[in-house]
């Protein structure tokens, strides 16, 4: 019964010291989104709750900004930020939908950005 699909920014790269927007979009489902969790590996970065709004994990408060939309902005990037990021949509009655984004933070001054994807 899970008919939805998640589109993400896919594999992206960014320069050290710069910022990047992580974006996911859930489509093709009538399910209602009650919460979106953003995680890096097994670490919770942020929660966007339909009722309560945004909560950024204390350890990331300085470098993570909510939005745009349900997305997440990572700032002051370091090489250690390289890795997998997950958007986890909690939906009724479908359950959870998970999107994956791989971010590579480059030392080089020339970082190729993946195709930027806009939420309509």
């Amino acid at each position: 019964m899970m008919t939805g699909t998640i589109e993400t920014t896919g594999n992206i790269s960014a320069e050290k010291g710069g910022s990047i927007i992580l974006q996911c979009h859930l489509s093709s489902t009538t399910a209602q989104v009650t919460q979106v969790n953003w995680e890096q590996q097994d670490q919770l970065l942020a929660i966007c709750n339909a009722d309560l709004g945004w909560h950024i994990s204390p350890s990331f408060k300085d470098r993570v900004a909510p939005g745009p939309g349900l997305g997440l902005t990572l700032q002051s990037l370091t090489v250690n930020d390289t890795g997998e990021y997950f958007c986890i949509y909690h939906t009724y009655p479908d359950g959870t939908y998970t999107g994956r984004i791989f971010l590579e933070v480059l030392e080089s001054s020339v970082a190729e950005h993946g195709a930027r994807f806009q939420i309509p």
């Epitope: 009650t34 969790n37 709750n49 009722d51 009724y92 009655p93 359950g95």
Partner: antibody, heavy 122, light 106 residues
Framework: EVQLVQSGSELKKPGASVKVSCKAS????????MNWVRQAPGQGLEWMGW????????TYAQGFTGRFVFSLDTSVSTAYLQISSLKAEDTAVYYC???????????????WGQGTMVTVSS | DIQLTQSPSFLSASVGDRVTITCRAS??????LAWYQQKPGKAPKLLIY???TLQSGVPSRFSGSGSGTEFTLTISSLQPEDFATYYC????????FGGGTKVEIK
């Protein structure tokens, strides 16, 4: 106080229509899905379906398509159930119920309306 | 659709008794199960969600356990106000309810 208040009992003739209202208060109406549940006299609970309070999109359970319509008026935080071409077997208490919980692990019908008795009799 | 089978359908017990109600799902539903109490002429009241989490304000004599296909609701010491009908509900997919268990005074 978080609550759902439903409209009063209805006595209808077969073939008529009825519209039951469910007014929410004390919370953000559009953040929580709304369900409708039927309970025939002396029987158990039967899930009729739900409406996405963010988009207004309704989903109907098997056996509740055609004559049953879920709708919303978000400006007054109210959900509606309309039943057309009423039959004797539609006689039941109809409940609206909110899905509480933010993550899927916590979903449950945490707030219920008091119920609306719909009697269909000639 | 996922079917829920509650047993027993009727249960006679006395105040102070330990009461256990079982709910079996036709397929695995992880821990996506809730329990409700309903008294005559009243709306159901949520007791337990996520199979074992007690809803705020519900007395601690109520507890839930299980995962997968078999779940139990236990009332450790039955009180006069606990005589009612109890329903399980799965939320793993489109919700369905069990047939109910009526707890009567012996």
């Amino acid at each position: 106080e978080v609550q759902l208040v439903q409209s009063g009992s209805e006595l209808k003739k077969p073939g008529a229509s009825v519209k039951v209202s469910c007014k929410a208060s004390g919370y953000t109406f559009t953040a929580y899905p709304m369900n409708w549940v039927r309970q025939a006299p002396g029987q158990g609970l039967e899930w009729m379906g739900w409406i996405n309070t963010n988009t207004g999109n309704p989903t109907y359970a098997q056996g509740f398509t055609g004559r049953f319509v879920f709708s919303l008026d978000t400006s007054v935080s109210t959900a509606y159930l309309q039943i057309s071409s009423l039959k004797a077997e539609d006689t039941a208490v109809y409940y609206c119920a909110r899905v509480g919980g933010y993550s899927v692990y916590d979903y449950a019908f945490d707030i219920w309306g008091q119920g609306t008795m719909v009697t269909v009799s000639s | 659709d996922i079917q829920l089978t509650q047993s027993p359908s009727f249960l006679s017990a006395s105040v102070g008794d330990r009461v256990t109600i079982t709910c079996r799902a036709s397929q695995g539903i992880s821990s996506y199960l809730a329990w409700y109490q309903q008294k005559p002429g009243k709306a159901p009241k949520l007791l337990i969600y996520a199979a074992s989490t007690l809803q705020s304000g519900v007395p601690s004599r109520f507890s839930g356990s299980g995962s997968g296909t078999e779940f139990t609701l236990t009332i450790s010491s039955l009180q006069p106000e606990d005589f009612a009908t109890y329903y399980c509900q799965q939320l793993n997919s489109y919700p369905t309810f069990g047939g109910g268990t009526k707890v009567e005074i012996k």
